[in-house]
């Protein structure tokens, strides 16, 4: 019987922010409740001279009025006692985009090909997650090697999120576009 309490989930041991920096393409995602990036999601992680990690991300968002915009998002990460668990503050470059604070866990990565990210926004009384999101990232926009695909599926099962992900298309929709020149 799988333990689905969030406190039992394993994360990447000895996570290295510097090795994680660079471009990651989101290949699959499990959505939370509400507004969220839809597709064409590309994130760029970096670490400054003080060791703080930050990220910018671009992706297509469908607003409540059914407008599609390419959103530019920014996030800063505060370290915790676990090197793979961060407190993330995020906001959209445009004022109408979402902002907030989430946990941001790096569940697993090999730094060179794949990464699995997880965030639980709301806990149930029994310690399981009531509202979560998760991304599968690849260094290559064409996808993941078969062995990486398998370990990713295993991690999805360990997060109690098997079969809850959907693939993310990368069709160039946001290449050279942003919300500033679409509205």
């Amino acid at each position: 019987e799988r333990d689905c309490r969030v406190s039992s989930f394993r994360v990447k041991e000895n996570f290295d922010k510097a090795r994680f920096s660079g471009t990651w393409y989101a290949m699959a995602k499990k959505d939370p409740e509400g507004l969220f990036l839809q597709d064409n999601i590309v994130a760029e992680f970096s670490v400054d001279e003080t060791g703080q990690m930050s990220a910018t991300a671009k992706g297509r968002v469908r607003l409540l009025n059914n407008w599609d915009v390419c959103a530019d998002m920014v996030g800063t990460f505060t370290d915790t006692e676990d090197p793979a668990k961060f407190k993330m503050k995020y906001w959209g470059v445009a004022s109408f985009l979402q902002k907030g604070n989430d946990d941001h866990w790096i569940v697993d990565t090999d730094y060179d090909t794949y990464a699995v990210q997880y965030s639980c926004r709301l806990l149930n009384l029994d310690g399981t997650c009531a509202d979560s999101y998760s991304f599968v990232f690849s260094r290559d926009p064409n996808g993941l090697p078969p062995e990486a695909q398998k370990i990713v599926r295993q991690r999805q099962e360990e997060l109690c999120l098997a079969r809850q992900y959907r693939l993310i298309v990368h069709n160039g929709y946001c290449d050279g576009r942003s919300e500033r020149n679409l509205l």
Epitope: D108, D110, Y111, D112, T113, Y114, S138, R139, D140, N142, G143, L144, P145, E147, A148, K150, I151, Q154
Partner: antibody, heavy 121, light 111 residues
Framework: QVQLQQPGAELVRPGTSVKLSCKAS????????MNWVKQRPDQGLEWIGR????????HYTQYFRDKAMLTVDKSSSTAYMQLSSLTSEDSAVYYC??????????????WGQGTSVTVSS | DIVLTQSPASLAVSLGQRATVSCRAS??????????MHWYRQKPGQPPKLLIY???NLESGIPVRFTGSGSGTDFTLTINPVEADDVATYYC?????????FGGGTKLEIK
């Protein structure tokens, strides 16, 4: 530290079977594949097949599909290879070797010391 | 199956000099942004030991005298400078597709 423990030697009769073991320690067994590699005296390395420690998915090279059967026991973190219908051609050293995506190598990063199988009447 | 052809089959190099081993694949072993070619060293009576993974990445604990290069179908292992401890047989191996395959090996001796 990662270790793959194999028995040193097996002496078996022609026409019989032998089951080789490879006990893993020092890592999460279900995160990796176990490969098996054959080496005849003064010869090169020949890949037999691999098995996923998580769900027992297997891949074999064509010749060994009828010769070798790979299994795992997750509870003891042990991989097994059964070789059947043994002939003198099966006399060799058999290595187990770990591989996987977790650390990004996609190569066989740890090897057992090998089991020397001698087929003789 | 992907056939890996190593050359030369054997070579003799003076201490302190450079040794170069070549491995050619019958088809590309490059996919998803990486070349899935690896190099191993085997000394007599011992199991193989990983030296280089994914064409050019030095395995932890391996001296920087060992370098791997190449992509697609043509790969090279270079040892510079060669030391007495390097006497061994060197193998390339691909993991781009099943069945995994090894090259025939290159035996390095000291001149």
């Amino acid at each position: 530290q990662v270790q793959l423990q194999q028995p040193g030697a097996e002496l078996v009769r022609p026409g019989t079977s032998v089951k080789l073991s490879c006990k893993a320690s020092g890592y999460r067994f279900t995160d990796y594949w176990m490969n098996w590699v054959k080496q005849r005296p003064d010869q090169g390395l020949e890949w037999i097949g691999r098995i996923d420690g998580y769900d027992s998915e297997t891949h074999y090279t064509q010749y060994f599909r009828d010769k070798a059967m790979l299994t795992v026991d997750k509870s003891s973190s042990t991989a097994y290879m059964q070789l059947s219908s043994l002939t003198s051609e099966d006399s060799a050293v058999y290595y187990c070797a770990r591989s996987g995506a977790v650390e990004g190598r996609y190569s066989m990063d740890y090897w057992g010391q090998g089991t020397s199988v001698t087929v003789s009447s | 199956d992907i056939v890996l052809t190593q050359s030369p089959a054997s070579l003799a190099v003076s201490l302190g000099q450079r040794a170069t081993v070549s491995c050619r694949a019958s088809e590309s072993v490059h996919s998803y942004g990486h070349s899935f070619m690896h190099w191993y060293r085997q000394k007599p009576g011992q199991p193989p030991k990983l030296l280089i993974y994914r064409a050019s990445n030095l395995e932890s604990g391996i001296p920087v005298r060992f370098t791997g290069s190449g992509s697609g179908t043509d790969f090279t292992l270079t040892i510079n400078p060669v030391e007495a401890d390097d006497v061994a047989t060197y193998y390339c191996q691909q993991s781009n597709e099943d069945p995994r395959t090894f090259g025939g090996g290159t035996k390095l001796e000291i001149k």
